[in-house]
Amino acid sequence: QLSRAGRSAPLAAGCPDRCEPARCPPQPEHCEGGRARDACGCCEVCGAPEGAACGLQEGPCGEGLQCVVPFGVPASATVRRRAQAGLCVCASSEPVCGSDANTYANLCQLRAASRRSERLHRPPVIVLQRGACGQGQEDPNSLRHKYNFIADVVEKIAPAVVHIELFRKLPFSKREVPVASGSGFIVSEDGLIVTNAHVVTNKHRVKVELKNGATYEAKIKDVDEKADIALIKIDHQGKLPVLLLGRSSELRPGEFVVAIGSPFSLQNTVTTGIVSTTQRGGKELGLRNSDMDYIQTDAIINYGNSGGPLVNLDGEVIGINTLKVTAGISFAIPSDKIKKFLTESHDRQAKGKAITKKKYIGIRMMSLTSSKAKELKDRHRDFPDVISGAYIIEVIPDTPAEAGGLKENDVIISINGQSVVSANDVSDVIKRESTLNMVVRRGNEDIMITVIPEEIDP
C-alpha cells in the first residue's frame, strides 16, 4: 500500500482513504516534465514541464517544479478550489553546470535535458557544480570564502611567480636537454626576476615561463653566489605583475608564512607554516656571507619551490625559499638581504662601484644546542655524540671549505685551539685568522682539517 506522504493538505476532494496502486492508470515510458504524484499522492503520473499550466484540471508539476499562480503565490488546494490556474516554475532559480559542459538556467532545465538525453539513449546529464560552467560558485557567506586566507594570498601573488628551467648541452650532439628547474618571482614590471643563485648555476641556458604559459630566454644580470641570490631578466612587452618586498626585520616568530613555487609549467606548489626563528645569524646558519641571516620556517621548502618567494599574509615577500635541512627545518634568505642585493646590483650596473672584500670559507652552518643535537640524532642514527659546536648544513662546491675537506653533517668543535660552541664563534675566527686549523667531529671520530679563507666580494 502506498502512503499519501507528500500530498497537499487539506486533502483534495475525491481522494480515496487508501491508495490502491492497481487502480493507477498506466504511464508512458518517457515524461517530458518528469514524474510526479497525482493530487491524491497515490499514483505516479507525468508531471507538467516547466512553463506549463498546472492546477485546475491540468495535473501536478514535474519533479523540482512548483505550481505558482499569478503574483507568485504557490498553488494550494484552496487556490485550486477557487478554480485559478498556475504555471509550473522551477523551485531552484540558480544556474547549474551540467556534465555535458552546458550551463542551465536552473536545475529543472538540466533535468529536462537529462531526460531528453536518456530518451536518445545517451548518458544522463548530471550536475557538476552550482553556478555557470567554468565559474566558481562564490558564496561570500560560506566558511571557505571567509576563512581561506592562505588561498587569498596565493591568488594574489601567483601571477608573479615564475617557473625557471635550465638546459644543458649533450657532450657530442650538443643538443639541449632540460637539466634542472626551480622558481623565481618578478620584482619589476619590465621583467627583472629574483631567484636563488644555485637555481641558475653556470654553463646553462635559462628559460623562464610565466603563469600564463608564455616563455622567454632569460639573461643573468647579477649573481651573489655567497648570499645565494641571482637577478635575471626577460624581455617582455607590456607590464608584468610584480611582488613587493616586505620587511623581514619586522617578522615575528609564529607568524604565518606561505612558500610558493612553480616547479612545473603552469602549476604552482604551495606550502605553509610559521616562522620558527627570525634572522638566524649567518653567523648561525652559514658563511656564504658573514653577515648573512636566514629565516627558519617549518613551511616545506624543496626543489620545487626553491628560488620562489616566502610571503606573509599581506602577500609581501619576506624571503627567498632556499634550502631544507631536514624534515621540519627549512630556511629562506630574508627580504632585507634581497633589498640590499638589488640596491647594490643597481649601483654596480650604474657605476661599477668598488666593493670591500670579506673573508669566506663556503659553508652553511647552524649552532648546535643540546635540543637540536637530540633532534638530529633522532633523525640520523650516525649523528655525532656532541651537544654544542657548529653543525655544517652544506659545503658549497669549489670553496675553501670543500678544498680543505669539510663535509655536510660535520660538527666543528674547535678552531686554532679555541673551542667552538656556536656558529658565531666560527664567523668571528674567520674574520680574524688567515688559516683555520679545525677539529671536526665526523660520525664518532675527530678529524683535523685546515681551511684557508678566501677574500670575496660581499
Epitope: L170, P171, S173, V179, P397, A403
Partner: antibody
C-alpha cells in the same frame, strides 16, 4: 632506478661482425647520450663512441672509425654497438655506459654502466 | 690527443693506511673523474668534477688537483677497497688512465 642490461657473451671468428645490445630503464632514454667503452684483458678502459638516442647523432673514436656503428631504438630504449672486421685484439669486455652530467660544474662523466659483454675473437 | 699517466700502476697497503694515487695529463683539463673497478665488475664512479663525492660513496674517498696534476686519496684503507682505480678526463673525448691496482698487505 637506472639500469643498463647488455646482451650475452659472443664468440666470433676473425673478419666477422658482432652486435651488442644495451637496454636502458629507469630514466628518460632520450635525455642522455649512450656511450660504449671497451676493456681488453689487462688493458685500460677505451672509449669507442656515443649516440644521442633522440636524433641518432653519433661520435666515434678515430681508432674505430669505419669499423664501429652505434645505433639506438628509441621505442625500445635500447642502444646497439656493432663492430665489424673483427681481429683477435678486439677480444674484450664491451660496456655501454650512460653519460652523466655535473649540474654544479657542467662536467661530463659516466655514471651508470651495463654489466659488460665479453666478445671473444678466435679462429 | 691528451695523454694520461696514472701512478703507481700497483700498490700494496695495510688496512687503515692513507693511500694516494696521482694522475697527470699532457695538457690542462677542467676536471678529473675517478672510478673503482672490482674484478669481473663494471667500473663505478667515485669522484666527479675533481673533488665531488658521487652519491653513496664513503667519505674516506676524496679527490683534488687542477690543471694537469690530480690526486685521489683513501684516508683510511678498508678491506673492501681492494680494486683497480682509474682516472678519466673528458676534454675533446673521454680517455682513461692505465689504472692502479690496489692490494692489501
Amino acid at each position: 632506478q637506472v639500469q643498463l642490461v647488455q646482451s650475452g657473451a659472443e664468440v666470433k671468428k676473425p673478419g666477422a661482425s658482432v652486435k651488442v645490445s644495451c637496454k636502458a630503464s629507469g630514466y628518460t632514454f632520450t635525455d642522455y647520450e649512450m656511450h660504449w667503452v671497451r676493456q681488453a684483458p689487462g688493458q685500460r678502459l677505451e672509449w669507442m663512441g656515443a649516440i644521442d638516442p633522440e636524433t641518432g647523432g653519433t661520435a666515434y673514436n678515430q681508432k674505430f672509425k669505419g669499423r664501429v656503428t652505434i645505433t639506438a631504438d628509441k621505442s625500445a630504449s635500447t642502444a646497439y654497438m656493432e663492430l665489424s672486421s673483427l681481429r683477435s685484439e678486439d677480444t674484450a669486455v664491451y660496456y655501454c655506459t650512460r653519460e652523466g652530467y655535473s649540474y654544479e660544474g657542467g662536467g661530463y662523466y659516466f655514471d651508470y654502466w651495463g654489466q659488460g659483454t665479453l666478445v671473444t675473437v678466435s679462429s | 690527443d691528451i695523454q694520461m699517466t696514472q701512478s703507481p700502476s700497483s700498490l700494496s697497503a695495510s688496512v687503515g693506511d692513507r693511500v694516494t694515487i696521482t694522475c697527470s695529463v699532457s695538457s690542462s683539463v677542467s676536471y678529473m673523474y675517478w672510478y673503482q673497478q672490482k674484478p669481473g665488475k663494471a667500473p663505478k664512479l667515485l669522484i666527479y668534477d675533481t673533488s665531488n663525492l658521487a652519491s653513496g660513496v664513503p667519505s674516506r674517498f676524496s679527490g683534488s688537483g687542477s690543471g694537469t696534476d690530480f690526486t685521489f686519496t683513501i684516508s683510511s684503507l678498508q678491506p673492501e677497497d681492494i680494486a683497480t682505480y682509474y682516472c678519466q678526463q673528458w676534454s675533446d673525448y673521454p680517455t682513461f688512465g692505465q689504472g692502479t691496482k690496489l692490494e692489501i698487505k
